[in-house]
């Protein structure tokens, strides 16, 4: 692949690998990608220090790099046609693995604007100076190179691989060798944290002199967010050494029996974990002191705890149990407030609906709006209500006063309106006369 010697640093939930080799940025990214990673991000000062550590490791292994000022690709690039934005920390560049822009940057010098070609970022290492945590590698921007022509002073690249979690390194209680094989195909005998899904091969013994016994373990998730090998007790234990070799592989105390056997133990305030090697702070939460949906939260160094309630609940006087908060006490609603377990809801009176400025506000329902009117004829909206009206010749009717009923003028309260015959019609009436009579011009009398 053109990428040679590599160094590894694993910390938190990520591993960084440094590789030497004169590759273009695209070739370097492809190399990282093939093993499930990307060219490294440097999103904070802490991450810059991790990257510097892995580069320092690489430089210790590399006999001689050709250039005094050496460059190593990281995953910061700007596509062709995308212009420089001096107002942003990343100046318009973005991380190849995606993710949001970050406030940290460490540019070597003021960037020149150029949108005509893709630009890539490398870390600039001055090999004449020791690598110090206070002097982090600067970011240098330039052409991305092409196969066979990586660009001036490009000496390698840094990859980053992210994991669900990490296992502690395996503890040896006697002579032996551990070899870790990571999911990104790196083998190492010394990792301060070992990534999830790594394999560990343990060969016990002192080479040819002893019978070698071997073990194989995988770093796996034993329970949610609990990563462990599943080995129990120190490995490669030997009566010849007892507790004298690497403290018997014990995390804290090692207790020897008379027969050369030994057991691991813990200092006061700590307990021995299932691996029979590691000690953890006695967890005051393990007795489940919190009740009613409260979550137990460990205090500093695992010495004490507090109970935390879900949103909408608060601790009661015992500070152990959760009780519902009556949010309605604070009158958060414009009209009606209904307290519910873990929350509340606002309701509006009849004639109002949720809306208007502010949380829990209510606005008048326009019952007379187009297509919504409950009235048969006229409708007038009022605050919180409405009223119906009828055209001439009709009166309001119905239980809810929304219907209009024709007035029978022929049987009106003032007696007959017509002198002779009266014909009621929808919304009106007309008069008529018996044969031989003619309706007068007033439309009422007969002549």
């Amino acid at each position: 692949t053109g990428a040679d010697t590599e160094a590894v640093v694993c910390v938190g939930t990520a591993c960084y690998t440094a590789h030497s080799g004169k590759l273009s940025a695209a070739e370097a990214q492809n190399h990282c990608n093939q093993n499930g990673g990307n060219l490294a991000t440097v999103k904070s000062k802490e991450e810059a220090q991790h990257v510097q550590r892995v580069l320092a490791q690489l430089l210790r292994r590399e006999a001689a790099l050709t250039a005094r000022m050496s460059k190593f690709w990281i995953g910061l690039q700007r596509e062709k046609g995308k212009c420089l934005d001096p107002s942003l920390p990343l100046k318009g560049f973005s991380w190849v693995g995606g993710g949001e822009d970050t406030p940290y940057s460490n540019w070597h010098k003021e960037l020149r604007n150029s949108c005509i070609s893709k630009r890539c970022v490398s870390l600039l290492l001055d090999l004449s100076q020791p690598l110090l945590p206070s002097r982090l590698p600067k970011w240098s921007e330039g052409p991305c190179g092409s196969p066979g022509s990586p660009g001036s002073n490009i000496e390698g690249f840094v990859c980053k691989f992210s994991f669900k979690g990490m296992c502690r390194p395996l503890a040896l209680g006697g002579p032996g060798q551990v070899t870790y094989t990571t999911p990104f195909q790196t083998t190492s005998s010394s990792l301060e944290a070992v990534p999830f899904a790594s394999a560990a091969n343990v060969a016990c013994g002192e080479g040819d002199k002893d019978e070698t016994q071997s073990h194989y373990f995988l770093c796996k998730e034993k329970a949610p967010d609990v990563f462990d090998w599943g080995s129990s007790g120190p490995l490669c234990v030997s009566p010849k050494y007892g507790c004298n070799f690497n403290n018997g592989g014990c995390h804290q105390d090692c207790f020897e029996g008379g027969d050369g056997s030994f057991l691991c133990g813990c200092r006061p305030g700590f307990r021995l974990l299932d691996d029979l090697v590691t000690c953890a702070s006695r967890n005051p939460c393990s007795s489940s002191p919190c009740r009613g949906g409260a979550t137990c939260v460990l205090g500093p160094h695992g010495k004490n705890y507090t109970c935390r309630c879900p949103q909408g609940y608060q601790l009661d006087s015992s500070q152990l149990d959760c009780v519902d908060v009556d949010e309605c006490q604070d009158s958060p609603c414009a009209q009606e407030c209904v307290n519910t377990p873990g929350g509340f809801r606002c309701e509006c009176w009849v004639g109002y609906e949720p809306g208007g400025p502010g949380e829990g506000a209510c606005q008048d329902v326009d019952e007379c709006a187009l297509g919504r009117s409950p009235c048969a004829q006229g409708c007038t909206n009022t605050d919180g209500s409405f009223h119906c009206s009828c055209e001439e010749g009709y009166v309001l009717a119905g239980e809810d006063g929304t219907q209009c009923q024709d007035v029978d003028e022929c049987v009106g309260p003032g007696g007959p309106l017509c002198d002779s015959l009266c014909f009621n019609t929808q919304g009106s009436f007309h008069c008529g006369c018996l044969p031989g009579w003619v309706l007068a011009p007033n439309g009422v009398s007969c002549t």
Epitope: A197, A199, Y216, F217, L218, K220, K222, A223, P224, D225, W229, G230, S288, C290, G293, A294, T295, C296, V297, P310
Partner: antibody, heavy 118, light 112 residues
Framework: QVQLVQSGAEVVKSGASVKVSCKAS????????LNWVRQAPGQGLEWFGR????????DYNGKFKGRVTLIRDTSTSTVYMELTSLTSEDTAVYYC???????????WGQGTLVTVSS | DIVMTQSPDSLAVSLGERATINCRFS???????????LYWYQQKPGQPPKLLIY???NLASGVPDRFSGSGSGTDFTLTISSLQAEDVAVYYC?????????FGGGTKLEIK
Amino acid sequence: QVQLVQSGAEVVKSGASVKVSCKASGYAFSSYWLNWVRQAPGQGLEWFGRIYPGDGDTDYNGKFKGRVTLIRDTSTSTVYMELTSLTSEDTAVYYCVRGDGYWAMDYWGQGTLVTVSS
Amino acid sequence: DIVMTQSPDSLAVSLGERATINCRFSKSLLHSNGITYLYWYQQKPGQPPKLLIYQMSNLASGVPDRFSGSGSGTDFTLTISSLQAEDVAVYYCAQNLELPWTFGGGTKLEIK
């Protein structure tokens, strides 16, 4: 598709032992926990152990420790559950169940009825 | 061990009506990562259990959306919004936060 195929029903004498197999197919056998859950007639479910086929790591329910052994054969993608010192209380349907990445038990074998007779 | 209490032991609901099953745990199942490790399984006669809901409220593949899960750290509810004939089964809650994994005693759901 994911399949867990268990061995057939067994009738065994009290005090004896039984070995039930579970053959997995359709997924990366080495990368998922295989749990064992049992169900006595008309009763609920009880978890009693699991194995990680990748390296053979096991965890057991303390209630059964010393009586149950889980082993795996990666060449045939099979897990074996052996339960010793059987009593009538151990009469149950035994299920092998895959544990997924969400810690759910997503695929279940068809079950193996073990009847302990006196 | 984490102990769970499932209620009711049995439940009869009319077709099309809402069915609610509860489960209470002796310890919060809410992990510091924000995930609640509570699961619901359905078991029909003569069949192995089937995963319905994982991590308190997520519907397993192929499960109808009339099923839903909710709850807090220790109290959980499985709801079937409109009961269908094929929902007749025994329902179990379970926790996979801490070993040993434990199950509720089961709720038998029948049609009224």
